[in-house]
Amino acid sequence: EEELQVIQPDKSVSVAAGESAILHCTVTSLIPVGPIQWFRGAGPARELIYNQKEGHFPRVTTVSESTKRENMDFSISISNITPADAGTYYCVKFRKGSPDTEFKSGAGTELSVRAKPSAPVVSGPAARATPQHTVSFTCESHGFSPRDITLKWFKNGNELSDFQTNVDPVGESVSYSIHSTAKVVLTREDVHSQVICEVAHVTLQGDPLRGTANLSETIRVPPTLEVTQQPVRAENQVNVTCQVRKFYPQRLQLTWLENGNVSRTETASTVTENKDGTYNWMSWLLVNVSAHRDDVKLTCQVEHDGQPAVSKSHDLKVSAHPKEQGSNTAAENTGSNERNIYGGSG
């Protein structure tokens, strides 16, 4: 009779994580008597996966009734495959004895595990940035195998090109991670914008995974200020308004100063939202002109989202009829202590 051969017909087998892997092995002869063992890897450090003779291998089942002498099929099924199971598996025939001695090995079957990438996590900068600034977004996904993977960045559906991507580790591994950093230039219209990281992998069957970041969490649009005055019914009263336009986020505090002295402070509440996601707000002062002997410098000072205050001033002429005028001068600390001013916001 011809000498026994151990046949592993599959050079490689690819299995999705969580599934079972069937590793085929047959022998060509019933002699010599002795057990079959399966190993992962070769050499002295090889790992025992299954021993026909003894041991407890809860994830391994034999495909045929391998306990019987007439059996020549020693294929095994390994359940609940994880990326850690990847490697080359050898079916090895031993000759019965004290000890059992290795008689012949199969050529090996390489098991590769297809593992899905985790959902991409997109993170933006720690601090908000203003339009025209470039900010960086990172995207991370882990645990996938094989290594080949495609990552794309989009802003509102438009593909971005300014990004760098790394897949780690560089060498062989049971699973891999991807890390990508994209640079995005902010515009004033980006409050409603989204940055999307899209990951495509063989395990996803053409349905890529996406991670998103809302630029509303990244952008700060500073307000523009406009101070105007309108006459009111009574000849000696003037209505001065401060229009705070196109700001984001909503957190805003406004202070009126009369000749450099704080007159009133209020927090933006009943704001109106623009189509682009920014907000507008208006605050007004009713000034009794007759109560002033000298000209009055009214300053609208706005502190937006914890940033340094910006202000707009308006010189109210007491001697002449009120007329609209404004200046960008900073508030002065000099001025009358006499007050006769009423205010509101809307």
Epitope: L30, V33, I36, K53, E54, R69, E70, K96, G97, S98
Partner: antibody, heavy 118, light 107 residues
């Protein structure tokens, strides 16, 4: 059903010969090692002989040179030729199959009695 | 030849008892050990092979353990049909050899 049936036992004088047969059914006979085991009345079991799939044979010292084992796969039959029989060979002779991968005996026949006496 | 020594030679026990029979080999037999049950006038029946593997169709109340030279057969809860003679056998090295047997009797 897997079955082994021995035959050929009987009374024989010391120095005489006897040929035991074992008819196998219910399995692929050629794929299994086969064994003979005996048991003197009221005593324990003693292995007598093995024939492998390839026809290789094995005996203990107590019967070597006197007993021969053979198989006829086409007839699903196992044989034990016993020559130069002694009183100490008196026993029930069982045919058994090496049914497991490791050649452990899994199926036994009902036995046939061999008595060596003058 | 490898000597197989069983103990005890006989054992009295009651229905429901848990009993253990031991078998010692004179040298390492690499777990190639079988256990058999034999009732009077009947052929031996295989229970265990390679020291701890349960033969097909054998109830799980029978279990085998051990390695190297020392082995045990345990019957977890004796039933009337379990009273019989039990033999161990090494089949690692020719000549295959049996223990002298342990007779399990009803107390």
């Amino acid at each position: 059903e897997v079955q082994l049936v021995e035959s050929g036992g009987g009374l024989v004088q010391p120095g005489g010969s006897l040929r035991l047969s074992c008819a196998a059914s219910g399995f692929t006979f050629s794929s299994f090692d086969m064994h003979w085991v005996r048991q003197p009345t009221g005593k324990g079991l003693e292995w007598v002989s093995t024939i492998g799939i390839a026809g290789d044979t094995y005996f203990p010292g107590s019967v070597k040179g006197r007993f021969t084992i053979s198989r006829e796969n086409a007839k699903n039959s196992l044989y034990l030729q016993m020559n130069s029989l002694r009183a100490g060979d008196t026993a029930v002779y069982y045919c058994a199959r090496g049914g497991n991968w490791d050649d452990a005996l899994d199926i036994w026949g009902q036995g046939t009695m061999v008595t060596v006496s003058s | 030849d490898i000597q197989m020594t069983q103990s005890p030679s006989s054992l009295s026990a009651s229905v429901g008892d848990r009993v253990t029979i031991t078998c010692r080999a004179s040298q390492d037999i690499n777990n190639y050990l079988a256990w058999f049950q034999q009732k009077p006038g009947k052929a031996p029946k295989s229970l265990i092979y390679t020291a701890s593997s349960l033969q097909s169709g054998v109830p799980s109340k029978f279990s085998g353990s051990g390695s190297g030279t020392d082995f045990t057969l345990t019957i977890s809860s004796l039933q009337p049909e379990d009273f019989a003679t039990y033999y161990c056998q090494q089949y690692n090295t020719y000549p295959y050899t049996f223990g002298q047997g342990t007779k399990l009797e009803i107390k």
